[in-house]
């Protein structure tokens, strides 16, 4: 029997300050590339090692972008927002949502090799 | 994880044509970046062409000859290659990567990419 998948979501603002080789990730969404369904967000899909995400080490693959410098990413074309990350400046304040997958066995079992506490 | 696989490699006479595929798996393909280097023997390897969501780029010594183009119903990308010459041989890989860098781009830095293909390999007699 398997337990249900729920999701823990939570929101953070990540300061960032562009190092030599820019904010160092890969992003996909946009109103004409949905990447997950009914949902034109944009989600980081790569963080570059040793680049500056990377090496702050708060934003992870998977994060929603919920803003950039305070400017909503809602109802963007997906070179609208890449484009908006790339005139950014120098420092540059993301608002993201991190989505933790949690898993939940099946009330009042306990599986096998589950930590006891 | 992304697996390349290439084909349409071969055997061809200088002035030839071929027409190589890149097959991807992974159900989000239309948002790779997707790019194809080549390698000579003894030599380094050789940015070719990419295509981003946003346009192509190619190395300016197959500019005109080389078409990159992409089905993303099909999980695949393409490269056209017109007016063969012997200096085109080589093996031909194709690379990717999720999504589109907030950063510029360099099309032609491995960096920029996170999946590799095994190769296919092309000789112009």
């Known amino acids: 029997m398997n337990g249900r998948v729920d999701y823990l979501v939570t929101e953070e603002e990540i300061n960032l300050t562009r190092g030599p080789s820019g904010l160092g990730f890969n992003i996909v969404g946009g109103t004409d590339q949905q990447y997950v369904s009914n949902d034109s967000g944009i989600y980081v899909s790569r963080i570059k090692e040793n680049g500056a995400a990377a090496l702050d080490g708060r934003l992870q693959e998977g994060d929603k972008i919920l803003s950039v410098n305070g400017q909503d990413l809602k109802n963007l074309l997906h070179q609208d927002a890449v484009d908006l990350f790339r005139n950014a400046g120098y420092a540059v304040s993301l608002r993201v949502q991190h989505r933790l997958q949690v898993q939940n066995g099946p009330i009042g079992h306990r599986g096998e090799g589950d930590p006891s506490g | 994880h992304v697996q390349l696989v290439e084909s349409g490699g071969g055997l061809v006479q200088a002035g030839g044509s071929l027409r190589l595929s890149c097959t991807a798996s992974?159900?989000?393909?239309?948002?790779?970046?997707m790019a194809w280097f080549r390698q000579a023997p003894g030599k380094e390897r050789e940015f070719v062409a990419a295509?981003?969501?946003?346009?192509?780029y190619y190395a300016d010594s197959v500019k005109g000859r080389f078409t990159i183009s992409r089905d993303n119903a099909k999980n695949t990308m393409y490269l056209q290659m017109n007016s063969l010459k012997p200096e085109d041989t080589a093996v031909y890989i194709c690379?990717?990567?999720?999504?589109?860098?907030?950063?510029?781009?360099?099309?032609?830095?491995?960096?920029?990419?996170?999946?590799w293909g095994q190769g296919t390999q092309v000789t112009v007699s």
């Open positions: 690379a990717a990567v999720i999504g589109s860098t907030v950063d510029s781009y360099t099309p032609s830095d491995p960096l920029e990419y996170d999946y």
């Open positions: 295509i981003t969501w946003s346009g192509t």
């Open positions: 992974g159900r989000t393909f239309s948002t790779y970046t």
